[in-house]
């Protein structure tokens, strides 16, 4: 909305935000960081949730794709008064609850979690946070961590998917703005186009799926191209090739003219899917055409 790079991916985005006592004088910077980042995810199929944690976890805004609700959620976020302990695991519990229960008729949307904290997690709190982050992962989520000020990068690397999923902000809260671009680039998985977008009925084809972030999967062997045919049957196909900006996939043979296949991508062997508005349609092809 404010120009610059944006993400067109259709997935569920969870912000899990530290509102413990230590961020009391820095909540504005956290809020503006979230607000700026939230506006860069612009797919109508993207849902967002705001979760805050201190001595307990609270879902400030449940998953929604409604931009007016997101605007109201941001207003609520701005009003948060920090205080309490750093029970990060409580935040992950609230996210996992939604990841599991907020499925759409058995169709599970891919989940991305961005967790922000400013302090070191002591003993049991780190154990619980890692355990809960692992549960979110087992539910199909990709987990990123933003560490500000007195964080322990080794801890955050174990809570996040890997060291590469940690964004250290060593220069204090005012430096949060400086990592928005890199977080957007790393956390965005988007399907932009399919080539060809029209295929011949009854024939086998390969489809190039153009987009970004396809190699963000924890294991690229688990990436799948998925074709939702005429809004009912879903066929999953293993890509021949997985690159960050494209996938080369076998397209299912669609027997009839006028059939439509909506393109989705799974990063975790079909556990959950990134949606798009990219459609492949069939047409009649005469011999030699």
């Amino acid at each position: 909305e404010d120009g610059g790079p944006a993400c067109y991916g259709g997935f569920d985005l969870y912000f899990i935000l530290d509102k413990s006592g230590s961020v009391l004088h820095h909540w504005n910077e956290i809020y503006y960081f979230v607000e700026q980042l939230a506006h860069k995810f612009i797919s109508p199929q993207l849902r967002m949730s705001f979760i805050v944690f201190s001595t307990r976890g609270t879902t400030l805004m449940k998953l929604t794709e409604d931009r007016e609700q997101i605007r109201q959620g941001l207003e609520e976020l701005q009003k948060v008064l920090p205080g309490g302990d750093t029970y990060m695991h409580e935040g992950f519990e609230r996210a996992s609850e939604q990841i599991y229960y907020e499925n759409r008729q058995g169709y599970r949307t891919a989940s991305v979690i961005i967790a922000l904290t400013d302090g070191e997690l002591h003993e049991d709190l780190f154990f619980y946070s890692e355990r809960e982050a692992n549960r979110s992962r087992d539910l199909g989520a990709i987990v990123y961590c933003v560490g500000v000020k007195d964080f322990n990068e080794t801890q955050l690397a174990r809570i996040a998917d890997s060291k590469d999923h940690v964004f250290p902000v060593n220069d204090g809260f005012q430096a949060l703005q400086g990592i928005i671009h890199s977080i957007l680039k790393k956390s965005c998985i988007e399907i932009l186009a399919a080539e060809p977008s029209t295929i011949c009925a009854g024939e086998s084809f390969q489809v190039v799926v153009r987009g970004n972030g396809f190699r963000h999967a924890r294991n690229v062997d688990r990436v799948l191209c998925s074709f939702k045919i005429n809004d009912s049957v879903t066929l999953n196909e293993k890509p021949f090739s997985v690159e960050d900006t494209y996938l080369l996939c076998p397209a299912p043979i669609l027997k009839e003219v006028g059939m439509k296949a909506a393109l989705q991508v799974s990063m975790n062997d079909g556990l959950s899917f990134i949606s798009s508005s990219v459609i492949i349609t069939t047409t009649h092809c005469s011999d030699g055409s």
């Epitope: 609230r94 549960r135 079909g270």
Partner: antibody
Framework: EVQLVQSGGGLVKPGGSLRLSCAAS????????MNWVRQAPGKGLEWVSS????????YYADSVKGRFTISRDNAKNSLYLQMNSLRAEDTAVYYC???????????WGQGTLVTVSS | NIQMTQSPSSVSASVGDTVTISCRAS??????LGWYQQRPGEAPKLLIY???HLQSGVPSRFSGSGSGTDFVLTITSLQPEDFATYYC?????????FGGGTKLEIK
């Protein structure tokens, strides 16, 4: 010891009501979703209802929707199933079970028999 | 609603044998499947979660496999205490559903 102890079963007439309870101990109850599952005499398992850890999400089997109400009190470490308008086909052993998706129903209560008969 | 179909409904085997029990979902459920054992007069017991993960404390002779619509529970080197009824259960979407059960009997 992790435990779920059930109470509240018994004999009730068709159209009557009953409230089942499930008391949890030995674990952080508020971190777990909870399910009710039933088993009619000589039959298989049938899922009845689920409630998420924060009570934000509640689901029922079609066969009990509108008649049964699941609830929990995290402060009391307790799960409940309020059963109204009971029918003969509701006769079963009812189990409560804890679950942390995606890890399955790993702890079950001992079961309590509900008999609906005139 | 997703239906779960188990086969066979009963199977006879001897101590030391290997048995396999199949479970089919009416639509894809990824790996959202659990296997439970129930002995007469007892509550069910979780054996396998997420299709192939062995629950803590369950002997390694139990294993699960499959993804999508077709799943298998394998019990190797059958022990006397394994003769019971086994249920699969999908947790991909609500309503949750159990299979009809497979009764494992001593031959």
């Amino acid at each position: 010891e992790v435990q779920l102890v059930q109470s509240g079963g018994g004999l009730v007439k068709p159209g009557g009501s009953l409230r089942l309870s499930c008391a949890a101990s030995g674990f952080t109850f508020s971190s777990y979703s909870m399910n009710w599952v039933r088993q009619a005499p000589g039959k298989g398992l049938e899922w009845v209802s689920s409630i998420s850890s924060s009570s934000s999400y509640i689901y029922y089997a079609d066969s009990v929707k509108g008649r049964f109400t699941i609830s929990r009190d995290n402060a009391k470490n307790s799960l409940y199933l309020q059963m109204n308008s009971l029918r003969a086909e509701d006769t079963a052993v009812y189990y409560c079970a804890r679950v942390r998706p995606p890890y399955g129903m790993d702890v079950w209560g001992q079961g309590t028999l509900v008999t609906v008969s005139s | 609603n997703i239906q779960m179909t188990q086969s066979p409904s009963s199977v006879s085997a001897s101590v030391g044998d290997t048995v396999t029990i199949s479970c089919r979902a009416s639509q894809g459920i990824s790996n959202w499947l659990g296997w439970y054992q129930q002995r007469p007069g007892e509550a069910p017991k979780l054996l396998i979660y997420a299709a192939s993960h062995l629950q803590s404390g369950v002997p390694s002779r139990f294993s699960g496999s499959g993804s999508g619509t077709d799943f298998v529970l394998t019990i190797t080197s059958l022990q006397p205490e394994d003769f019971a009824t086994y249920y699969c259960q999908q947790s991909n979407s609500f309503p949750l559903a159990f299979g009809g059960g497979t009764k494992l009997e001593i031959k």
